[in-house]
């Protein structure tokens, strides 16, 4: 006879999986809030800053009620991938001024990467359709000046904060429906 069968594979509780994703998202939200505050102290923002290459905010708080789990996770993953790419770009091309935000910017990048892996795992555990491979994104142009890099940093951290805030609310709401 062959080897004894292994223990039956326990299907993870989706609520527990979502809990752990919420915790990671909330932790990253706090990191982003604190880093954005540090940036504002070092380089005060003169008004709101936008970056055309950033994703538009996925959902207003008022529209959360209509959310469905696959759509939320797919959209969140796509948006966070874009923010990860922008943070990497900022660290690489942001200029010497933004070096004062290290190692925090590096920590943020690592945690963003970890959250993306957690979302991927959650989608596979919940047997959700896997999104197609990401098409290669066009390279981001380097900032035109040191202040261009700082303005981009304000836009990236501000947008990431809004996205993560939306994500925490959305994930908590979805958890009540599981």
């Amino acid at each position: 006879p062959g080897p004894p069968p292994g223990p039956p594979r326990v299907s993870p509780d989706p609520r527990a999986e979502l809990d752990s994703t919420v915790l990671l998202t909330r932790s990253l939200l706090a990191d982003t809030r604190q880093l954005a505050a540090q940036l504002r102290d070092k380089f005060p923002a003169d008004g709101d800053h936008n970056l055309d290459s950033l994703p538009t905010l996925a959902m207003s708080a008022g529209a959360l009620g209509a959310l469905q789990l696959p759509g939320v996770l797919t959209r969140l993953r796509a948006d966070l991938l874009s923010y990860l790419r922008h943070v990497q770009w900022l660290r690489r091309a942001g200029g010497s001024s933004l070096k004062t935000l290290e190692p925090e910017l590096g920590t943020l990048q690592a945690r963003l990467d970890r959250l993306l892996r957690r979302l991927q795992l959650l989608m596979s555990r919940l047997a959700l359709p896997q999104p197609p491979p990401d098409p290669p994104a066009p390279p981001l142009a380097p900032p035109s000046s040191a202040w261009g890099g700082i303005r981009a940093a304000h836009a990236i951290l501000g947008g990431l904060h809004l996205t993560l805030d939306w994500a925490v609310r959305g994930l908590l709401l979805l958890k009540t429906r599981l």
Epitope: D19, R26, S27, D31, Q38, R40, K42
Partner: antibody
């Protein structure tokens, strides 16, 4: 040794104003975010306001928003709380507190507190 | 707003006994943002534990913290006379920063 000393408390009538100060020493004041926390007589702790080292990010509790203003003068190693339109429910001991680091690790250092009494 | 609920409101124990204080959080929070304070009458609060389980500087090893998600615990392994005080938990992950209502630890 880190030291925080509050002053400026006292008796004020409802609708009146008061300005609290917190003198800091024993650390590089300009490197740390600062908080005000209050405690009504016989009650628990309530966070009031927070200001980052460079004063560019400020948060308030909803109960004081629009009435209280937190500020700081890094050259004087001082933190302030301007309190306007005071109400009876603002009666409390007001503490200034320093964050442990820029990434939240709690209110690591506290002053001894200054009592504000709002009464007619 | 994240609400913290402490239990019991009052805990009556004798020196040498073990004390277990609970803090229940209305929302999931990462453990690194949950802190515990001790306050004695007429004194300012003192940070005991930060990040749910890290002992603050100068705090005796009989104090320990644990927990994750929504349920956190402060344990005093063997009570000393100076440990009788009010204990508060606090979250720093979300603005407004909030405290629990406190647990009064009194001598039996």
């Amino acid at each position: 040794e880190v030291q925080l000393v509050e002053s400026g408390g006292g008796l004020v009538q409802p609708g009146g104003s008061l300005r609290l100060s917190c003198a800091a020493s024993g650390f590089t004041f300009s490197s740390f975010g600062m908080h005000w926390v209050r405690q009504a007589p016989g009650k628990g702790l309530e966070w009031v306001a927070y200001i980052t080292p460079g004063s560019n990010t400020i948060y308030y509790a909803d109960t004081v928003k629009g009435r209280f203003t937190i500020s700081r003068d890094n050259a004087k190693n001082s933190l302030y709380l301007q309190m306007n339109s005071l109400r009876a429910e603002d009666t409390a001991v007001y503490y200034c507190a320093r964050e442990y680091s820029s990434y939240d690790e709690g209110f690591a250092y506290w002053g001894q507190g200054t009592l504000v009494t709002v009464s007619s | 707003e994240i609400v913290l609920t402490q239990s019991p409101a009052t805990l009556s124990l004798s020196p040498g006994e073990r004390a277990t204080l609970s803090c229940s959080v209305s929302d999931l929070i990462p453990s690194q943002y949950l802190h515990w304070y001790q306050q004695k009458p007429g004194q300012a609060p003192r940070l005991l534990i930060y990040g749910a389980s890290n002992l603050a500087s100068g705090i005796p090893a009989r104090f320990s913290g644990s927990g994750s998600g929504t349920d956190f615990t402060l344990t005093i392994s063997s009570l000393e006379p100076e440990d009788f005080a009010v204990y508060y938990c606090q979250q720093g992950v979300d603005v407004p920063f909030t405290f629990g209502q406190g647990t009064k630890l009194e001598i039996k």
